[in-house]
């Protein structure tokens, strides 16, 4: 039994880090493998993660972590019974994938303006709370070509757009994701999408 693709890990910079790897053949990850992880400092405890299958030869492990700080560094040991298959380390602050934003809501009652709001996925004391920027994806359910991305580079989790920038009388969906420039993070997963019917008053044309 050998590791084909070494574990790569990402942290939500709060409570979970997720590690994925591939074995050289079909593996029952939960019965055959264990991933041990330990914070590097004197007297720290070793924790054991039981991996789950992620495709035939793929494994994934969710490592529970206390509040992450930038100095945290973990040793990782992948075991198959008594055999050490791989040894590595992981610094959560250097491999961050933010949590997805939540509670995306489209407010259509503001005169001819769409107000999209969502929730920052971090509590105020978390470092990422004040460092997230967002991308909002809006698309038409009727027309696959009607697909747009709005970059929200300010801190407020909201976006205003004129309803008239979208077609009237049809349904749209929106979703949002986050990233943090300060930690050069990857993008979060997209939030669940929300749907609304776009309608607005056409401007009166004078001839």
């Amino acid at each position: 039994m050998k590791v084909l693709q070494e574990p790569t890990c990402v942290s939500d910079y709060m409570s979970i880090s997720t590690c994925e790897w591939k074995m050289n053949g079909p593996t029952n990850c939960s019965t055959e493998l264990r991933l041990l992880y330990q914070l590097v400092f004197l007297l720290s405890e070793a924790h054991t993660c039981i991996p789950e299958n992620n495709g035939g030869a793929g494994c994934v492990c969710h490592l529970l972590m206390d509040d992450v700080v930038s100095a945290d560094n973990y040793t990782l040991d992948l075991w198959a019974g008594q055999q050490l298959l791989w040894k590595g380390s992981f610094k959560p602050s250097e491999h961050v994938k933010p949590r997805a934003p939540g509670n995306l809501t489209v407010h259509t009652n503001v005169s001819d303006t769409l107000l999209l709001t969502w929730s920052n996925p971090y509590p105020p004391d978390n470092y990422l709370y004040n460092h997230l920027t967002y991308a909002v994806n809006i698309w038409s359910e009727n027309d696959p070509a009607d697909f747009r991305i709005y970059n929200v580079t300010y801190l407020e989790p909201s976006l205003r757009i004129a309803a008239s920038t979208l077609k009237s009388g049809i349904s749209y969906r929106a979703r949002v994701r986050a990233w943090a420039r300060c930690y050069n993070t990857t993008w979060s997963e997209w939030s669940p999408s929300t749907k609304w019917h776009n309608s607005y008053r056409e401007p009166f044309e004078q001839h």
Epitope: F41, H62, D67, D125, S191
Partner: antibody, heavy 115, light 107 residues
């Protein structure tokens, strides 16, 4: 091995105060965020409060906000819950529980609020 | 605040039965969900975290699934020591909230 031992519970009248303590051993307390969780007699679990190891930030359940204060003394390996303006509905066994996500619990201390 | 609704609140089952307990969150919590077991007079112990990750030392007959708002704890073949109360917990945001519990009793 990890051990959490609560103390300070007892009988108190409505409107009174109590201070609960939780002494930790078997791990580096200063590196761990901590929680208080309670359970009223015959009822379910209710999260009460949290204190971060990283920032010292604190969070509370709405039911205790403004009345309870969580704190810690890393030099004494101790977690505290100062409970003021106690009500009948605060009667419960109070547990301290360690992060991440309540991986270790103390045995609990009973707080009874009654006249 | 996020509400966690567990069902059923109580159930009777026999040794060897397959038992399923569900937990519904009032809003999306991704996979930030854990399951705990509590026996009478004892302290709760964590069975599952991150919705589907089995806690080390917990028998493999316990499994968790779900994401978003719908979650399930399954005991594939109920053993005598599994008669207890089970709680789900969301830790996606503060305040953290538990489900009201599911008591699994002997039929």
């Amino acid at each position: 091995q990890v051990q959490l031992v609560e103390s300070g519970g007892g009988l108190v009248q409505p409107g009174g105060s109590l201070r609960l303590s939780c002494v930790a051993s078997g791990f580096t307390f200063s590196h761990s965020s901590m929680n208080w969780v309670r359970q009223a007699p015959g009822k379910g679990l209710e999260w009460v409060s949290y204190i971060s190891r990283a920032t010292g930030a604190v969070y509370y359940a709405d039911s205790v906000k403004g009345r309870f204060t969580i704190s810690r003394d890393n030099a004494k390996n101790s977690l505290y819950l100062q409970m003021n303006s106690l009500r009948d509905e605060d009667t419960a066994v109070y547990y301290c529980a360690r992060e991440p996500v309540f991986d270790y619990w103390g045995q609990g201390t009973l707080v009874t609020v009654s006249s | 605040d996020i509400q966690m609704t567990q069902s059923p609140s109580a159930m009777s089952a026999s040794v060897g039965d397959r038992v399923t307990i569900t937990c519904r969150a009032s809003q999306d919590i991704s996979n930030y969900l854990a399951w705990f077991q509590q026996k009478p007079g004892k302290v709760p112990t964590r069975l599952i975290y991150a919705a589907s990750s089995l806690q080390s030392g917990v028998p493999s007959r316990f499994s968790g699934s779900g994401s978003g708002t719908e979650f399930t704890l399954t005991i594939s073949s109920l053993q005598p020591e599994d008669f207890a109360t089970y709680y789900c917990l969301q830790w996606s945001s503060y305040p953290r909230t538990f489900g009201q519990g599911t008591k699994v009793e002997i039929k």
